[in-house]
């Protein structure tokens, strides 16, 4: 399977909410022994590999934000902890999964990574990630609403193994 990032750049004004999205593509095994671990974290454009470093989002780690379920099942993060930090990650039946960040500030600007790990018989088998940038703007140059920029076709199917 692959992970697609429909948008490579989100530009938002302070105070706005944004939903960053990734999509699971390709054949997804729906066997009973297969589950998917999906999560989000901040990172940087490393010298070696983008998304190799896992940093917290608003002090919540990738473990705090993870979803763990079968192939194309729907799921949401544990509400209390994430919502106290203005965050919610979710996954639908169609392979889309997202993180919503509320009341953005300039400090939320940076590189965000989604990670999908396929787990068979309790062992990590295959992992892929997608990357996108969020820029939060202040002042007179800030847009009135979030503006999204589509990934190039090459970027949108980010298949780099982690």
């Amino acid at each position: 399977f692959k992970v697609a990032t429909p948008y490579s750049l989100y530009v938002c004004p302070e105070g706005q909410n944004v939903t960053l999205t990734c999509r699971l593509l390709g054949p997804v095994d729906k066997g009973h022994d297969v589950t998917f671990y999906k999560t989000w974290y901040r990172s940087s454009r490393g010298e070696v590999q983008t998304c190799s470093e896992r940093r917290p989002i608003r002090n919540l780690t990738f473990q705090d934000l993870h979803l763990h379920h079968g192939g194309h099942q729907a799921a949401n993060t544990s509400h209390d902890l994430a919502q106290r930090h203005g965050l919610e990650s979710a996954s639908d039946h169609h392979g889309n999964f997202s993180i919503t960040m509320r009341n953005l500030t300039l400090l939320d600007s940076g590189l965000y990574c989604c990670l999908v790990v396929e787990i068979r018989h309790h062992h990590s088998e295959h992992r892929v990630h997608g990357a996108m940038e969020l820029q939060v703007q202040t002042g007179k140059d800030a847009p009135s609403n979030c503006v999204v920029y589509p990934s190039s076709s090459q970027d949108s199917e980010n298949i780099t193994a982690a």
Epitope: T105, L106, L107, Q135
Partner: antibody, heavy 121, light 111 residues
């Protein structure tokens, strides 16, 4: 080793435009950092002017915003400051500085040596 | 703008003795549990250099006699044993909201 080096005229006439460049070496400007200008009038404290990211997003101090333009040239690994309609109050040492935004702290971890710009006729 | 106020504005310390500088922000500089407060030292004729970031994290290469503490609006920089090379002006700086702002500076001299 990351180094920043400011360059530009040391003397600017009142009402003209101050132009400075900061050359970045030992590090790619196309990374998750904000590239800042900060100034310090003689014998006084530090004032943040503004920053630019490699992708061209800027943020300026509202007190100077109407006169400031910061630009980036990724091909030359450098960024620049233009401050228009200068007066004697703009006389200061001008520093460029790097600030990571891949975390939440946004600290200035690398500074240039600074260049003194005097506004005088 | 967030106004940063340092006290004292100057202090004279005997080598080997401790020193303490306070910084107060006009509003909280916390963001989801992180204190967005830095300390810098500007030695004579040099640019500022980072000492402490996020209130209490000592920058790599900075001697361990420097420490930072505090949260919300009140912060402190401590030097456990002042050395001659510590002279200069100390600045606090907030990165919670733009414009980024600095304290007015505290000048440290050796007795």
């Amino acid at each position: 080793q990351v180094q920043l080096q400011e360059s530009g005229p040391g003397l600017v006439k009142p009402s003209e435009t101050l132009s400075l460049t900061c050359a970045v070496s030992g590090f790619s400007i196309t990374s998750d950092f904000a590239w800042n200008w900060i100034r310090q009038p003689p014998g006084k404290g530090l004032e943040w002017i503004g920053y630019i990211t490699y992708s061209g997003f800027t943020n300026y101090n509202p007190s100077l915003e109407s006169r400031v333009t910061i630009s980036v040239d990724t091909s030359k690994n450098q960024f620049s400051l233009k401050l228009s309609s200068v007066t004697a109050a703009d006389t200061a040492v001008y520093y460029c500085a790097r600030q990571e935004y891949g975390n939440y702290v946004w600290y200035f971890d690398v500074w240039g040596q600074g260049t003194l710009v005097t506004v005088s006729s | 703008d967030i106004v940063m106020t340092q006290t004292p504005l100057s202090l004279s310390v005997t080598p080997g003795q401790p020193a303490s500088i306070s910084c107060r922000a006009s509003e909280s500089v916390e963001y989801y549990g992180t204190s967005l407060l830095q300390w810098y030292l500007q030695k004579p004729g040099q640019p500022p250099q980072l000492l402490i970031y996020a209130a209490s994290n000592v920058e790599s290469g900075v001697p361990d006699r420097f420490s930072g503490s505090g949260s919300g609006t009140d912060f402190t920089l401590k030097i456990s044993r002042v050395e001659a090379e510590d002279v200069g002006v100390y600045y606090c700086q907030q990165s919670r909201k733009v414009p980024w702002t600095f304290g007015q500076g505290t000048k440290l001299e050796i007795k």
